[in-house]
């Protein structure tokens, strides 16, 4: 069970020449209301057939009086949503008729007069629980803009509102084989009524009355643990007699996907990837053409004119999918260079650049050193979007303004003593070590490890770091 919701955004003249006359006048003020009629998508009934999925009537809109000589504007609309409750499963594909009615409020005898102003119709695919889908339909010179969605009524969830949700029994997680109910993560999918006696821990069912075993369990009620030692195949179904997992049909064996669909196994069942023009659990639904307006989000439908024609949707920027139904996460392509932050605004991408970078994609490295001075003889080095000073000996800090203590980093190894010097630092090495930083041990026989001590210096002498 659930509710189909329709939000009318605007009703007014469509683009192009031949703007319609306003439906109301000073002599005959009027107001609009809307009627929606829903049918399962594969109904073969004519337009006059009953609204098998349900129908709804909006409230009356505000009274409107035409301004003389003015073109018909977007007309004032009723408040609120049109809601069509559905009792059974949501069919996934549905046909709709949306009618715009005019209620004339003149001095008619016997109350207001009603007349049909425009009727639009189409066939759409829609999963329950999904986001609002936007649509534009034209009827003659009129244009109707609207959004719609289907949502499940608790405890039903899922794209067809056929799964049930129940509050969690345990606070931490759902029971074996049961998923949390997105978006109600504090609830769990309610189990179907499986075959009587089916193990609640090791069995599950996808149809009422069946008992299918989780891996490692077998038997008609999934109560027999599998002994895999003498078994040849890791796949079920389980053999109750041997307690083995014997080779058997997987969910994709025999390909349950019709019309050339390809089957892939899922942990609990199978999934069909359908060729263009087919959809449904087993790709059994067909017959959608460009006439049905199957391309969402302003996609351009291209295809033949026949009842069996396939179609292709050319999607506008920012959308993808066979019906342009998926919003592209354009930021996932990381279009912003040099660490810029990507913002997808829907109509456009924006990059917020780090300091030192500019351009639509942060591709321009600004001249970081322009107008920057490094003190005390330091030189400016560009890089990473920020300037850096390479300081002269004895100076440090961001702009080389600080007098450096060359001994602060304890540069002399092996206990050597560091002395600050006007041109750098000097290490006085401990006995047994030598080198500019006292890094080389002196061998007992007087020979040093490479490199050799320069001539004129005895091992152990203080050596100035040049």
């Amino acid at each position: 069970a659930g509710v189909f919701e329709l939000q009318i955004h605007s009703f007014g003249p469509g683009p192009g020449p031949g703007a319609p006359r306003s439906p109301c006048s000073a002599r005959l003020p009027c107001r609009l209301f809307f009627r929606v009629c829903l049918k399962p998508g594969l109904s073969e009934e004519a337009a006059e057939s009953p609204c098998a999925l349900g129908a709804a009537l909006s409230a009356r809109g505000p009274v409107y009086t035409e301004q003389p000589g003015a073109p018909a504007p977007d007309l004032p609309l009723p408040d609120g949503l049109l809601q069509v409750p559905f009792r059974d499963a949501w069919p996934g594909t549905f046909s709709f008729i949306i009618e715009t009615w005019r209620e004339e409020l003149g001095d008619q005898i016997g109350g207001p007069a009603w007349s049909l102003l425009a009727r639009v119709a189409g066939r759409r695919r829609l999963a329950a629980g999904g986001p609002w889908a936007r649509d534009i339909q034209r009827a003659g010179a009129w244009e109707l803009r609207f959004s719609y969605r289907a949502r499940c009524e608790p405890p039903a969830v899922g794209t067809a509102c056929t799964r049930l949700c129940r509050p969690r029994s345990a606070p931490s997680r759902c029971g074996p084989g049961l998923r949390p109910c997105a978006p109600l993560e504090d609830e769990c999918e309610a189990p179907l009524v499986c075959r009587a006696g089916c193990s609640p821990e090791h069995g599950f069912c996808e149809q009422p009355g069946e008992c299918r075993c989780l891996e490692g369990w077998t038997g008609p009620l999934c109560t027999v643990p599998v002994s895999t030692s003498s078994c040849l195949s890791p796949r079920g179904p389980s053999s109750a007699t041997t307690g083995c997992l014997v080779p058997g049909p997987g969910p994709c064996d025999g390909n349950p996907c019709a019309n050339g669909g390809s089957c892939s196994e899922t942990p609990r069942s199978f999934e069909c990837t359908c060729p263009r023009g087919f959809y449904g659990l087993r790709c059994e639904v067909s017959g959608v053409t460009c006439a049905d307006g199957p391309c969402f989000n302003g996609g351009l439908c291209v295809g033949g004119a026949d009842p069996d024609s396939a179609y292709i949707c050319h999607c506008p920027p920012g959308f993808q999918g066979s019906n342009c139904e998926k919003r592209v996460d354009r930021c996932s392509l990381q279009p912003c260079r040099n660490g810029g932050l990507c913002l997808d605004l829907g109509h456009a991408l924006r990059c917020r650049c780090r300091a030192g970078f500019a351009g639509p994609r942060c591709e321009h490295d600004l001249d970081d050193c322009a107008g920057r001075a490094c003190a005390n003889g330091g030189t400016c080095v560009e890089g990473g979007g920020a300037h850096r000073c390479s300081c002269a000996l004895g100076f440090g800090g961001r702009d080389c303004r600080e007098r450096a203590d060359p001994c602060a980093a304890r540069p002399c190894a092996h206990g050597g003593r560091c002395y600050a010097h006007f041109s750098g630092l000097v290490c006085a090495c401990a006995p047994g070590y030598m080198g500019a930083r006292c890094e080389f041990p002196v061998h007992p026989d007087g020979a040093s490890a490479l490199p050799a001590a320069p001539p004129g210096l005895r091992p152990g002498d203080p050596q100035r770091y040049l």
Epitope: L42, S43, E44, E45, A46, A47, S95, A121, R123, R276, G287, V288, T289, C290, A291, D292, L300, C301, V302, G303, G304, A305, D306, P307, D308, S309, A310, Y311, I312
Partner: antibody, heavy 121, light 112 residues
Framework: EVQLVESGGGLVKPGGSLRLSCAAS????????MSWVRQAPGKGLEWVGR??????????DFAAPVKGRFTISRDDSKNTLYLQMNSLKAEDTAVYYC????????????WGQGTLVTVSS | DIVMTQTPLSLPVTPGEPASISCRSS???????????LDWYLQKPGQSPQLLIY???NRASGVPDRFSGSGSGTDFTLKISRVEAEDVGIYYC?????????FGPGTKVEIK
Amino acid sequence: EVQLVESGGGLVKPGGSLRLSCAASGFIFNNAGMSWVRQAPGKGLEWVGRIKNKIDGGTTDFAAPVKGRFTISRDDSKNTLYLQMNSLKAEDTAVYYCTARGWYGDYFDYWGQGTLVTVSS
Amino acid sequence: DIVMTQTPLSLPVTPGEPASISCRSSQSLLHSNGYNYLDWYLQKPGQSPQLLIYLGSNRASGVPDRFSGSGSGTDFTLKISRVEAEDVGIYYCMQALQTPFTFGPGTKVEIK
């Protein structure tokens, strides 16, 4: 501007052959289902046959009077439709129109200006 | 094959007055997808045919709103709310449900 320009018509003897061409421009040819429709002098319209677009399989269908004698082909790279007419009969005399129909956002249905085929001895 | 019939075959009209043409098919043109595969064409004197209405009731691009199509199944109607002089010519209905596509015999509309 959308244009369908037929060519190849003319006078041919019964039993002879003729190949008509239809050059398309101004729309995306390979999306369209293409048909030939003819009109005998002073008569109504008669559908001859069609070729589907590539995504619908590019298959052909024909009206009973021409089946087995006429073939339709298309060269999407040249935006051209062909009608090969063999074993022509006097009753094939007509103006032959090339038509394109399908969807490109909106429904479209374009017709050429026609080319006259006269079958006479 | 689906046979199409039209009435009347000739229709004298007065400019500014409404006109109506009927088209009947030998079998239903309503497809299971809910659309009626019937088109209306106008062939003006010396010209190629032009599409007026597709799928039974949808006005083709650029067609004035005085033209409207209605009907379902086997019975269809083309209405002109106010005939203009430029509307003269032969009107054909065509079924596009199944091949071979077939045309009606045509209705000749002329000014009285």
